[in-house]
């Protein structure tokens, strides 16, 4: 775009150098040449030369007319024809850009991953904008009316501690953008009641030689929570259907879990959890992949025990996957991917 | 009580450098976001920049890549280095707490003078 250019002239967009994407444009061009009397005036647009709709209105000043303009950016530019020029002589140029305020946005969900030290808030931004859009978290105390602000562009991690003179907050995120500005709706959050275990990891799995194999997974987390509720899902690679098998899980230890599967078989597990009677889940983990061995001829397997679950006390689900190639649907963003909350020294610029 | 007190403004000759200070007491400084605002003669308050408790900053488009905002949250203090200074940068500077939206920056300091100006 054009940043810096000697204008010998002027040029103004009406209504506004940043625009409603959709609306009616006119853009003037004005020259101030010395030493020029302009047969035409020119309009070009990211470099190339318009040429409907474009009204000289006196001997200095052009406009050119855009119905629905709906390009995200473009750069403009005017020139003047000088007799005996040979060359057009530029007069001025602007960078112009529309797009749409923001919507509210949406599904505001804050979590503390457990040994994180933050407190991570999302939400859905809704439709595209086109145009520079910013988000001012704000984080209200409950107990101590103290309000703090955040900015952001697409989440937010907050340092817990800066949230040690309360427990319960009121937090709510504000759209921003040159065309307009949304709130979403207010999220009441108690810092006990968004804890997010420790990631959990099924680290491995073993199917024993016995006359009805057994397969036993084996899976662990390293978090303090004493009561954690945890769901394992599993199926064969080439099924759509997941089936889920429901756990209280105590991780002082390694835990075990029972499975009497086909034989001969390529299974996918994946397991998450979360602290019993809460929200929040945490993301699958990945998917753990485990063959089960082959059947020997002394067997005669019984097809009618599928789903070949051992069935205990655990409740037995099943779910169907949207698609085989999205095995690990995500509750939430993986904090995997979030950018570190700027520490002092290190400024996130998101200007 | 809170307090903001401004200084470092001054007469400057355009494409000249200021170095504003904000100092700040009464309120828990380093958990509050601070805005840099600027009333030019004649008109009203815009915003210059803002920075959050993290260091998050983010800057009104007519000072982008001139202006740069920090702060130092042991001396309780918020600073704006202004360079590559324009006629059009002339005004009062404020700092305020709280970012720029949805702000009426009610809770602000007396301001400093800023004269560019050959």
């Known amino acids: 775009g054009i940043t810096s250019i000697n204008c010998s002239g002027d040029m103004w967009v009406e209504p506004g150098e940043i625009f409603q994407m959709g609306m009616n444009v006119s853009i003037y061009c004005q020259e101030a040449l010395k030493h020029c009397r302009p047969r035409n005036l020119y309009f070009y647009k990211n470099g190339f030369k318009e040429e409907f709709d474009i009204t000289r209105i006196n001997r200095t000043t052009a406009r050119i007319w855009y119905k629905g303009f709906s390009e995200p950016h473009a750069y403009m530019h005017c020139t003047a024809e000088c007799p005996g020029h040979f060359q057009e002589t530029l007069i001025c140029g602007k960078d112009i850009s529309s797009g749409h305020p923001p919507d509210a946005p949406s599904n505001l969900t804050c979590v503390i991953y457990e040994y994180s030290g933050n407190m991570t808030c999302t939400w859905n931004t809704g439709k595209p904008t086109y145009i520079d859009t910013k988000y001012i978290v704000h984080v209200k105390s409950l107990e101590t009316e103290e309000e703090q602000q955040y900015l952001a562009s697409s989440y937010v991690k907050i340092s817990t501690d800066s949230l040690q003179g309360s427990r319960k907050y009121l937090v709510w995120v504000q759209a921003v953008n040159s065309l307009g500005m949304e709130n979403s709706q207010q999220l009441h959050v108690h810092l006990d009641d968004i804890v997010i275990p420790s990631a959990s990891i099924i680290s491995r799995a073993e199917t024993t030689n016995d006359t009805v194999p057994k397969t036993i997974v084996y899976w662990k987390s390293k978090t303090m929570i004493e009561k954690v509720f945890c769901e394992m899902r599993y199926k064969t690679t080439t099924n759509q259907t997941w089936s889920v098998k429901e756990f209280d899980a105590n991780f002082t230890y390694v835990q075990q879990s029972e499975f009497y599967l086909e034989p001969d078989s390529k299974y996918v597990f994946q397991v998450r959890c979360q602290e019993t009677g809460k929200r929040n889940w945490q993301p699958w983990s990945s998917p753990f992949v485990h063959q089960t061995s082959q059947e020997t001829g002394k067997r005669n397997w019984q097809p009618w025990s599928s789903p070949f679950v051992h069935q205990t006390s655990q409740t037995v689900s099943q779910v169907t996957a949207k698609s085989s190639h999205e095995p690990q649907k995500m509750e939430m963003l993986s904090a995997t991917i979030f950018r570190g909350h700027p520490a002092s020294g290190n400024h996130q610029d998101i200007g | 009580q809170v307090q903001l007190q401004e200084s470092g403004g001054g007469l400057v000759q355009p494409g000249g450098s200021l170095r504003l200070s904000c100092a700040a007491s009464g309120f828990t400084f380093s958990r509050s976001a601070m805005t840099w605002v600027r009333q030019a003669p004649g008109k009203g308050l815009d915003w210059v920049s803002g920075i959050d408790s993290g260091g998050t900053t983010v800057y009104a488009d007519s000072v982008k890549g001139r202006f740069t905002i920090s702060r130092d949250s042991a001396k309780n203090t918020l600073y704006l280095q202004m360079n590559s200074l324009k006629t059009e940068d002339t005004a009062v500077y404020y700092c305020?707490?709280?970012?720029?939206?949805?702000?009426?920056?009610?809770?602000r300091g007396q301001g400093t003078q800023v004269t560019v100006s050959s």
């Open positions: 305020a707490i709280g970012l720029p939206w949805g702000n009426t920056w009610r809770t």
